[in-house]
Amino acid sequence: GALEVQVPEDPVVALVGTDATLCCSFSPEPGFSLAQLNLIWQLTDTKQLVHSFAEGQDQGSAYANRTALFPDLLAQGNASLRLQRVRVADEGSFTCFVSIRDFGSAAVSLQVAAPYSKPSMTLEPNKDLRPGDTVTITCSSYQGYPEAEVFWQDGQGVPLTGNVTTSQMANEQGLFDVHSILRVVLGANGTYSCLVRNPVLQQDAHSSVTITPQRSPTGAVEVQVPEDPVVALVGTDATLRCSFSPEPGFSLAQLNLIWQLTDTKQLVHSFTEGRDQGSAYANRTALFPDLLAQGNASLRLQRVRVADEGSFTCFVSIRDFGSAAVSLQVAAPYSKPSMTLEPNKDLRPGDTVTITCSSYRGYPEAEVFWQDGQGVPLTGNVTTSQMANEQGLFDVHSVLRVVLGANGTYSCLVRNPVLQQDAHGSVTITGQPMTFPPEA
């Protein structure tokens, strides 16, 4: 009869930039040799060749040199395909064709995803606000995929659905920046929260702004910065907000503005003698020159690195003098955990196995939680290690040792405490004897 080719029913979800395995397996008959095997992976819709194995040899990748088979596992019927450095454009259906004497095929879907950054909130106008004023609050979250869902609520948790305009702008990589604009009339004070949800990753990123309308006191220059740390994703640009209230007749010639590192007093950027004196911080900073006259002394920090984390002080001197410090909290989302099992063949109830859960390139250090199929936390026999790479990002490896029951599911959840981003992986060990992975 026809050859039975097996692939997962559910789409394979892969984070942009990570590697994905498109599982495909067949059952080789006794005496099967690779010389008999013809294996073709192709794009289901366009029939474009992706990778092939024929005449006993891996014919290599026909897909931007980013695919590989598992040569050591082919003889056991594992025809899975490894797709490296996943891109948005890879999303879609891949067909696995296997021919020995008989022939069979099956299609597996790849769903690409990318987590959204912690939303940044901007307020306009942002000075001299009084109850009854109408303000525009913009919630922006960057570099996610697929399109996000955005939800607003007030301080009491009541959804705000009126006067909201949400736009999705695709960037150069085809990832989405989402911008949601809420218009509200201010009460005596109020908190407005924006939640950006990635529907595929079930990842929620949220931010809120509390507005307390008030008059500025007179006297020294009042310099205002956000109370909460500014959270910035590694590689993105961050705005360290700082504002002052210029008096009537104020001109930029009167302004002395200095940004420096709070702890070391290292100069970061300055504006003096009516001129932007430029960046003293690796040429990665900029002011907003068109906005300075309106009292916006904010600093743009480009291509944020882990080493940028810390406190920055904004000094403003006109006739009077004032300063305030803003904290920069750097973050990077953790990849979807990969799970490995050792030993991974001929497992029986009573065997002790080591399950390793690995998640990569996050910051700051992750929290890792294990639980069984019933949701019961597993805390014993867990060793979690965090390894920093060249950029100071962390790879987290958590090792769980368990004695197998008749069957069992073991889940690992990797939490980024700053982004409140949860990434999880699980493995189900069923039957006896069995071989892992049932899905490569």
Partner: antibody, heavy 117, light 111 residues
């Protein structure tokens, strides 16, 4: 009724600067992403810039550095500051209100910019 | 950059007949959720006017004789039955990734 009225176009020498304005009415200006699109004498349409809020802007690489889009939500005005102008910047410049997936839902009548010695 | 190629560059269609304009993208402008292709009509001396957004959605106020279809790289604007006032140049535009680009235009004449 949504109305967009551009102004500020004219004749400018190569290397010169010009600031275009677009007065918006008939909708809540601050709630929408606004854009500039230009049309060359050969009738080719080119996206120039988009702005979400004062510090969130988008440009094609070819316009970055030379063109700056800004907005004044209090006065319902969109701006395009153009510098280091070249002859190939000669075009009709349209102000447009963007839709939620970066299409251009409403257009002004345009203002003509001619860069010539 | 994604290049949009429109064809034909011009066409003449008899009153009441069907006009079909094609727009081909150099790479896919679709995701599993949407196709990020939009269509505009421009008459001499006027700005472009949005007809269709996200490949197949008719903009408010646009007559139902205009329709859009397609996904991936191939998209079509259909006008049926063609009326006198449809004489214009039609442009496609994508918003799948930066920079957003337009097709070169198709000029429709009514016979």
């Amino acid at each position: 009724e949504v109305k967009l009225v551009e102004s500020g176009g004219g004749l400018v020498q190569p290397g010169g600067s010009l600031k275009l304005s677009c007065a918006a009415s008939g909708f809540t200006f601050s709630s929408y992403i606004m854009s500039w699109v230009r049309q060359t004498p050969e009738k080719r349409l080119e996206w120039v810039a988009s702005i979400v809020s004062s510090n969130i802007t988008y440009y094609p690489d070819s316009m970055k550095g030379r063109f700056t889009i800004s907005r004044d939500n209090a006065r319902n005005i969109l701006y395009l500051q153009m510098s280091s102008l070249k002859s190939e910047d000669t075009a009709m410049y349209y102000c447009a209100r963007s839709g939620t997936r970066a299409w251009f839902a409403y257009w002004g009548q345009g203002t003509l910019v001619t860069v010539s010695a | 950059d994604i290049v949009l190629t429109q064809s034909p560059a011009s066409l003449a269609v008899s009153l009441g007949q069907r006009a079909t304009i094609s727009c081909r993208a150099s790479k896919s402008v679709s995701t599993s959720a949407y196709s990020y292709m939009h269509w505009y009509q421009q008459k001499p001396g006027q700005p472009p006017k949005l007809l269709i957004y996200l490949a197949s959605n008719l903009e408010s106020g646009v007559p139902a004789r205009f329709s859009g279809s397609g996904s991936g790289t191939d998209f079509t604007l259909n006008i049926h039955p063609v009326e006198e006032e449809d004489a214009a140049t039609y442009y496609c535009q994508h918003s799948r990734e930066l920079p957003y680009t337009f097709g070169g235009g198709t000029k429709l004449e009514i016979k």
